[in-house]
Interface confidence: low
């Protein structure tokens, strides 16, 4: 370990701390008998700035004038080099380069709350790179002065720890901050203020809300404030909204009535306070109060649709469907739906409450005129009922919309277009577009979707509950009074070739021809709407091209005759299915020979 500066000294003039741009003289001198042995003129003193040589001199001392030192700390080390030996460290010095403090700017003071303490902030200006002390001085009436010092190099905030009181709210106080370092000092412009200027009230607390008679129209917000508060700002918004409603109130004394709240909505409320109309500053916003407004009876009416299904000569099945009310219409939690079914001529009626579902199915006679009414109920009451006369929606052929088409429109959308019916188009009161997944069995449990369209529209974009690679049965109804006409089409939003072909399950012989029966392709393998089936056949062990028969796809069809087979010839048969995107792979192969020789 080097015994530092035992062999010599490094002195710095004028000082170890210098102003940026100043010149400094560095002297390195050897103590007596500390040079190289024998010949002092062989002493070679070398001055390093950090680890870079900047000067050298033969003799007992070295003088170096250094300029252009950067802001911050620079280390100088003096070393002695003798012949045939390593350099020996003599001594060193750090030089600190900085600037005098700039004038502190934008001095401002605040007292948080009537019981708080005065604290001030300012902008320091550029970094001095030296230790700089800040002194904050506050002078008030009756020659009172307070002083506080800051020992943090980045000091731009000080709390006096004193409390200004409202006894003389108009009394003037003056604050000033002074920055001092070894290169100079600078003071801010004085900041003069009164109690009312700098006291920022504490945010209101203990916020509560009261709904008189559980009604949203009689709502009062309560809170507590510091004693001198004159003004309040209230802001409130539904919890799912980003926009605030703002209200300014004077002399509220901790309460305010709110008149425009929506029912059954969670709101967030905040309040801020101020001591004077035009002096001082607003408090921070209070902590949020979250509260749900009471329910009100539902508004609006349910959108109801229905489906009829023939059961036998005397009975029919009616399935009713309805859509949930929007949140703003429901105005509360819907507890149940009330469905009333009425026979209009005989006056028979039945009412049922439905919970947890938005559909209802019943069986009624095929005779009589039937109507239904559906309403939604919450804890405060019921919506107006939606009334529908049950009719045969497709009975009026002249009301059937024409040229219905369904085309894919981007991801999971289908554009349905049609032409008005031949019968006077002005008779149409509305169109209803209905769609449901196509299931070969005609399954009534498949969810039904619908939308209503104005009578002047001839297209509708359907996107709700539309999945890729699924075929939908789409119906367009034209409704006019108690009559309706309909047209249907199959459509998909996206399609591919089917993943498999139909499975032939039986081949039977009938009067010289054969009847082929097959199982439908599973829905998840159809990959869209099927357009055709193809039946292929060729003689067993033959290399000839197969013959084929193409059958347009119909939902219920699963058999087809072929009468072009030769007797006593063994044939191989198979089937494929086609969508607009292409043909499936082969289904299973079956061999068959006419005249009872089937395998």
């Amino acid at each position: 370990k080097i015994d530092a500066c035992k062999r010599g000294d490094v002195t710095v003039k004028p000082s170890h701390v210098i102003l940026l741009g100043s010149t400094v003289n560095i002297t390195c001198s050897l103590k007596p008998r500390q040079g190289c042995f024998h010949y002092s003129r062989r002493n070679k003193l070398i001055l390093y700035k950090f680890d870079r040589r900047i000067n050298f001199h033969h003799g007992h001392s070295l003088n170096s004038q250094v300029t252009g030192l950067p802001l911050g700390t620079t280390l100088f080390v003096c070393k002695l080099a003798c012949i045939n030996s390593d350099e020996i460290q003599i001594c060193g010095a750090e030089i600190f380069v900085g600037v005098a403090p700039e004038q502190p700017q934008n001095l401002s003071c605040i007292q948080k709350g009537e019981q708080g303490t005065v604290a001030c902030t300012w902008e320091r200006g550029r970094d001095t790179h030296l230790y700089t002390e800040y002194t904050l001085q506050l002078s008030g009436p009756k020659n009172l002065t307070w002083q506080k010092q800051c020992k943090d190099i980045y000091c731009d905030y000080l709390d006096f720890g004193i409390n200004l009181t409202p006894e003389s709210p108009e009394s003037n106080f003056t604050a000033k901050v002074t920055a001092v370092n070894s290169l100079g000092s600078s003071s801010s412009l004085p900041s003069t203020f009164t109690f009312l200027d700098i006291v920022r009230p504490l945010p209101p607390w203990d916020i509560r809300i009261k709904f008189q008679k559980a009604s949203v129209s009689r709502c009062t917000l309560y809170w507590r404030d510091e004693g001198l508060v004159l003004l309040n700002r209230l802001r409130y918004r539904p919890s799912n909204s980003r926009l605030w409603n703002m209200v300014n109130v004077t002399k509220a004394k901790g309460r305010h009535d709110l008149l425009d709240l929506k029912p059954f909505t969670e709101y967030e409320f905040q309040i801020s306070s101020k001591l004077h109309l035009y002096k001082g500053s607003w408090s921070d916003w209070s902590e949020s109060l979250r509260a749900q407004t009471p329910e009100e009876e539902p508004t609006g009416m349910l959108d109801v649709w229905y489906m009829k299904r023939h059961i036998d000569y005397s009975r029919q099945q009616i399935s009713l469907f309805w859509k949930n009310l929007s949140v703003s219409e429901a105005r509360g939690k819907i507890l149940h739906y009330q469905v009333t079914l009425q026979e209009l001529t005989g006056g028979k009626a039945m009412t049922q409450n439905i919970t947890g579902h938005t559909s209802w199915t019943t069986v009624i006679p095929r005779t009589g005129n039937w109507a239904v009414a559906v309403s939604a109920a919450n804890s405060k009451g019921s919506s107006l009922p939606t009334r529908i006369n049950i009719m045969n929606l497709c009975e009026a052929g002249l009301l059937a919309p024409r040229q219905v088409s369904a085309n894919s429109e981007g991801m999971d959308n289908i554009l349905v277009t049609w032409q008005p019916p031949r019968k006077d188009p002005s008779a149409v009161q509305e169109y209803v577009v209905e769609w449901r997944e196509l299931h070969p069995g005609g399954d009534t449990q498949v969810p039904l979707n619908w939308l209503r369209s104005r009578p002047y529209n001839v297209s509708a974009l359907i996107s709700e509950n539309i999945k890729s690679y699924i075929c939908y049965e789409i119906r367009v109804y034209a409704l006019s009074g108690d009559q309706g006409g309909c047209s249907s089409i199959l459509g998909n939003s996206k399609h591919k070739a089917p993943l498999s072909g139909p499975h032939i399950n039986a081949i039977t012989e009938e009067k010289g021809s054969i009847l082929i029966s097959w199982n439908s392709i599973p829905v998840q393998e159809q990959m869209g709407c099927l357009l055709h089936y193809r039946i292929y056949w060729k003689e067993r062990d033959s290399n000839s091209q197969p013959q084929l028969c193409e059958i347009p796809y119909r939902v219920s069809q699963n058999s087809h005759p072929i009468n072009s087979l030769q007797p006593r010839v063994t044939y191989v048969l198979w089937m494929t299915a086609l969508t607009a995107a292409g043909e499936s792979s082969h289904g299973n192969e079956r061999e068959f020979c006419l005249q009872g020789k089937a395998n």
């Epitope: 500066c5 460290q89 060193g92 900085g98 030296l130 190099i153």
Partner: nanobody, 115 residues
Amino acid sequence: QVQLQESGGGSVQPGWSLRLTCAASGFTFSTSGMHWFRQAPGKGLEWVSSISSGGGDTYYTDSVKGRITISRDNAKNTLYLQLNDLKSEDTAVYYCSKDPSGATRGQGTQVTVSS
């Protein structure tokens, strides 16, 4: 965070000695150059002495050379300042610092020299 705690100050007569200690934590002491500053009553902060991280290089302000010795024990994370032949003008609060501007420093220890 960086913590520096000075101790060892006191009231002494001129010519006496004191050894000041600075206990450091919250940073890698063994790789940091360390510094002593002092502030006399009514004066600004004055740099006194510095020592390199390994302890091999030491520096002193001209007014204290020969009377003051800076040293360190990296194993104990401790910095020392030996004050000999104390004079009345050495009366001040002494601070140890991690940086040469004196920004990161402790609370200080009071040294009072009077007869």
